[in-house]
């Protein structure tokens, strides 16, 4: 568990990708807030529940997010 801190960001390290969409169980987008002044994207991998921080500025990750949200909207009744 991360130490308590004044700034409550989650990500210490970020990946530019590539990350296969099929490998992701959950994609969490945490908007910038008073406690963390940056957007954070956390992918939970299906295989081992490993959580990876993704680079919000990366073109690959932006495309991934777009594809992920399209997939979710197709699933919705």
């Amino acid at each position: 568990i991360p130490l308590a801190r004044t700034v409550r960001c989650n990500c210490i390290h970020i990946d530019d990708g590539p990350v296969r969409m099929r490998a992701i169980g959950k994609l969490e987008i945490i908007p910038a807030s008073l406690s963390c002044p940056r957007v954070e994207i956390i992918a939970t991998m299906k295989k081992n529940d490993e959580q990876r921080c993704l680079n919000p500025e990366s073109k690959t990750i932006k495309n991934l997010m777009k594809a992920f949200s399209q997939k979710r909207s197709k699933r919705a009744p």
Epitope: I12, D16, R38
Partner: antibody
Framework: QVQLVESGGGVVQPGRSLRLSCAAS????????MHWVRQAPGKGLEWVAV????????YYADSVKGRFTISRDNSKNTLYLQINSLRAEDTAVYYC????????????????WGQGTLVTVSS | DIQMTQSPSSLSASVGDRVTITCRAS??????LAWYQQKPEKAPKSLIY???SLQSGVPSRFSGSGSGTDFTLTISSLQPEDFATYYC?????????FGGGTKVEIK
Amino acid sequence: QVQLVESGGGVVQPGRSLRLSCAASGFTFSNSGMHWVRQAPGKGLEWVAVIDYDGIIQYYADSVKGRFTISRDNSKNTLYLQINSLRAEDTAVYYCATERGTHYYGSGSFDYWGQGTLVTVSS
Amino acid sequence: DIQMTQSPSSLSASVGDRVTITCRASQGISSWLAWYQQKPEKAPKSLIYAASSLQSGVPSRFSGSGSGTDFTLTISSLQPEDFATYYCQQYNSYPPTFGGGTKVEIK
């Protein structure tokens, strides 16, 4: 290939200050959490501090809290460790290391290490 | 802080021997364990992460196993270049902590 080169060590008197640097190349420094780990002569490894990829988060070992400051300059691909109020027990080789990044909040396991810089605190 | 206890603290072995080093955590750390090799006057080198994943470029004679509190590093057939000190390290929670090290010496 990944290269980390520490500098700034030397012999210092107790109570004085020192700034260590770690020049990084061969990977995307601005994406990487970075750590300092130290090793006293003939002893084991002790984690000192970590800083996140853009310098917002810093954690410290209890033994150095309040005296050490970790920082980074992503435009220069350089990591720093400012050490104040040096004590004899700070005598060690100081290594910088790259974060593996498997936990979303930073794993604290280390992929690559520099060659280290020796800090000797002696009057 | 989580305490890591390594055993033995040193061992003597011959080239070709199978060597096993154990590491015990003071509380459960899932599989968040790494192993490092350090040679005299050199920086540590990452061997294994996530208890059993081999770091890229590390020979397959090195393997890791375990989860929870008990972990093992095995060198299946000791080579001359493997004589070194080995450290385990937990990264389940901050601060990351290391075992005291196991020195593998030539018999």
